[in-house]
Interface confidence: medium
């Protein structure tokens, strides 16, 4: 499928501390590494093994994993040992996705937003709770206030600045002739001065199969930079697109399977079917990357009845540019993104 075939288990059972005698030892010290690092298949990360010894090709979704043979961190995979009770020695690489969260004894579903108190707005994302403060930490009053102090005001959730003047009388606002404004005014002015910024999406973290693309945006209530992510799949790993290049041609810019399909992610299936386009490949050293694309929301339904949605890169068209670096270096494209002067057909 277009996103990934997914494991059926999503148990997050921690390994017990006792009964480790029967667990095999996968790490050997001192380290014994081959003279040269392995050559990884297209789209597979070259990483340091779990023993922190040697370079290895990261285990992929559905592969067996151990403390030494670790799952591809660039694809958001973890080693699920739940199928190897009670040894917890050999697991299966699974996608960390769609996992609920527990905060202060309260369970929240993946994707659920909530306010644990009046000061924070939180969201459960894949087992992690991310919170943004609702009380802006605005600057203290200006020079006219030598002793600013934050105090709780009855009936207000957020603390506010007050000024204690020489007579030790709290004063909430500035003298009228200073032209300064109180904390609320500063918040409003700060929002007026907030310049919205959204960075371009980074290149997909993998050259084939499921990857992640990120961007930074401050388009939010707080005007604070936050990282957004989307799933991406430039081309399937299990199709040899080279064989589809027509005789006499050097590139196939776009590959589109004939049949529509449902995306699957961590055992959950998209609620509608899609017929995605993928970027093709070249016979020479050129790379094919998206030219016209957008981000769509894909809704998934899980076997347990829960659902979630993910932002996904949707490819409309691709072009094949002139420079192609190591396809296993997922950060190479971040150095310089080709401009359209490099287009070649």
């Amino acid at each position: 499928t277009a996103l990934s075939p997914a494991p059926t288990t999503m148990d997050f059972t921690p390994a017990p501390l006792e009964d480790t005698s029967s667990r095999p030892q996968f790490c050997k010290w001192p380290c014994e590494c081959p003279p040269s690092p392995p050559r990884c298949p297209l789209g597979v990360s070259l990483i340091t093994d779990g023993c922190e010894c040697c370079k290895m090709c990261a285990q992929q979704l559905g592969d067996n994993c151990t403390e030494a043979a670790i799952c591809d961190p660039h694809r958001g995979l973890y080693c699920d040992y739940s199928g190897d009770r009670p040894r917890y020695a050999i697991g299966v690489c699974a996608q960390v996705v769609g996992v609920g969260c527990v905060l202060d004894g309260v369970r929240y579903n993946n994707g659920q937003s909530f306010q644990p108190n009046c000061k924070y707005n939180c969201t459960c994302i894949d087992g992690a709770v991310g919170c943004t403060p609702l009380c802006l930490r605005v600057r203290p009053p200006r020079l006219w206030c030598p002793h600013p102090r934050r105090v709780s005001i009855p009936g207000h959730c957020c603390e506010q600045w007050v000024c204690e003047d020489d007579a030790k009388r709290p004063r909430k606002t500035a003298p009228r002739d200073t032209g300064a404004f109180d904390a609320v005014g500063e918040v409003e002015a700060w929002h007026r001065n907030c310049i919205a910024y959204t960075s371009p999406w980074s290149p997909c973290s993998t050259s084939c199969g499921l990857g992640v693309s990120t961007r930074i945006s401050n388009v939010n209530a707080q005007c604070w930079p936050e990282q957004e992510s989307r799933l991406c799949n430039l081309r399937p790993c299990d199709v040899d697109i080279h064989t589809l290049i027509k005789a006499g041609k050097k590139c196939l810019a776009v590959y589109q399977p004939e049949a529509s399909m449902n995306f699957t992610l961590a055992g959950c299936i998209s609620t509608r079917s899609y017929q995605p386009k993928y970027c093709g490949v070249c016979m020479d050293n050129r790379c094919c990357i998206p030219y016209k694309s957008k981000t769509i929301d894909v809704s998934f339904q899980c076997p347990d009845g829960l659902g979630f949605s993910r932002q996904v890169l949707w490819i409309n068209a691709c072009f094949c540019n002139l420079s192609c670096r190591n396809p296993n270096d997922i950060f190479a494209d971040l150095e310089s993104y080709p401009d359209f002067s490099e287009i070649a057909n």
């Epitope: 959204t198 027509k246 810019a253 776009v254 016209k292 957008k294 949707w314 409309n316 068209a317």
Partner: antibody, heavy 120, light 110 residues
Framework: QMQLVQSGAEVKRPGASVKVSCKAS????????INWVRQATGQGLEWMGW????????GSAPAFQGRVTMTRDTSIGTAYMELSGLTSEDTAVYYC?????????????WGQGTLVTVSS | QSVLTQPPSASGTPGQTVTVSCSGR????????VDWYQHLPGTAPKLLIY???RRPSGVPDRFSGSKSGTSASLAISGLQSEDEADYYC???????????FGTGTKLTVL
């Protein structure tokens, strides 16, 4: 109801630039790409390029690269197409059209067209 | 010049069925869906068929589209006088990275 309303007719000198606007209403402006298509008198339809109002990303046909600039102002739901280095061959009716490329739904809404005349 | 080829003209009498052809390449019609537009003089073009054979709401079922390989066709049954217009096929071209229109067919209702 959904519609695209374009700016009025323009008369330009050769070498000058023209900027045509296209105001969208009745739908979410950032959810659909805006395309620009032109038709010279007695000629067929010619696609100039596309712009994604959400990201500002755009792409143009090779025939217009370096001459066409597509921008937008999401706060007022308006797309703009600026064509520079005008010649008499650029005399045409210019249309904006929206498409949801993700659903391959074609250009399902069009502006009324803007006549640009290039004459010395 | 256009990479989608259409006959310059077609004609028919009221009530007849007329077919307009559109010939392309593997990089456009062969690998992408085809759209059809009706263009009346002095008005904006109107989408008749999208995704090769689907009709937008409001388009009469007298209009139908089909695609086979690198060719597509538009069929208009029960021809009416108001169908007299220019008809264009169009498709995205993966090699050129452009949306290409056909050369256009002028339909005359006799």
């Amino acid at each position: 109801q959904m519609q695209l309303v374009q700016s009025g007719a323009e008369v330009k000198r050769p070498g000058a630039s023209v900027k045509v606007s296209c105001k969208a209403s009745g739908y979410s402006f950032t959810n659909f790409d805006i395309n620009w298509v032109r038709q010279a008198t007695g000629q067929g339809l010619e696609w100039m390029g596309w712009m994604d109002p959400n990201s500002g990303n755009s792409g143009s046909a090779p025939a217009f690269q370096g001459r066409v600039t597509m921008t937008r102002d999401t706060s007022i739901g308006t797309a703009y197409m600026e064509l520079s280095g005008l010649t008499s061959e650029d005399t045409a009716v210019y249309y904006c059209a929206r498409d949801d490329f993700y659903d391959s739904s074609g250009f399902d809404a069009w502006g009324q067209g803007t006549l640009v005349t290039v004459s010395s | 010049q256009s990479v989608l080829t259409q006959p310059p003209s077609a004609s028919g009498t009221p009530g007849q069925t007329v077919t307009v052809s559109c010939s392309g390449r593997s990089s456009n019609v062969g690998s992408n869906t085809v759209d059809w537009y009706q263009h009346l003089p002095g008005t904006a073009p109107k989408l008749l068929i999208y995704s090769s054979n689907r009709r937008p709401s409001g388009v009469p079922d007298r209009f139908s589209g089909s695609k086979s390989g690198t060719s597509a066709s538009l069929a208009i049954s029960g021809l009416q006088s108001e169908d007299e217009a220019d008809y264009y096929c169009a498709a995205w071209d993966d090699s050129l990275n452009v949306y290409v229109f056909g050369t256009g067919t002028k339909l005359t209702v006799l």
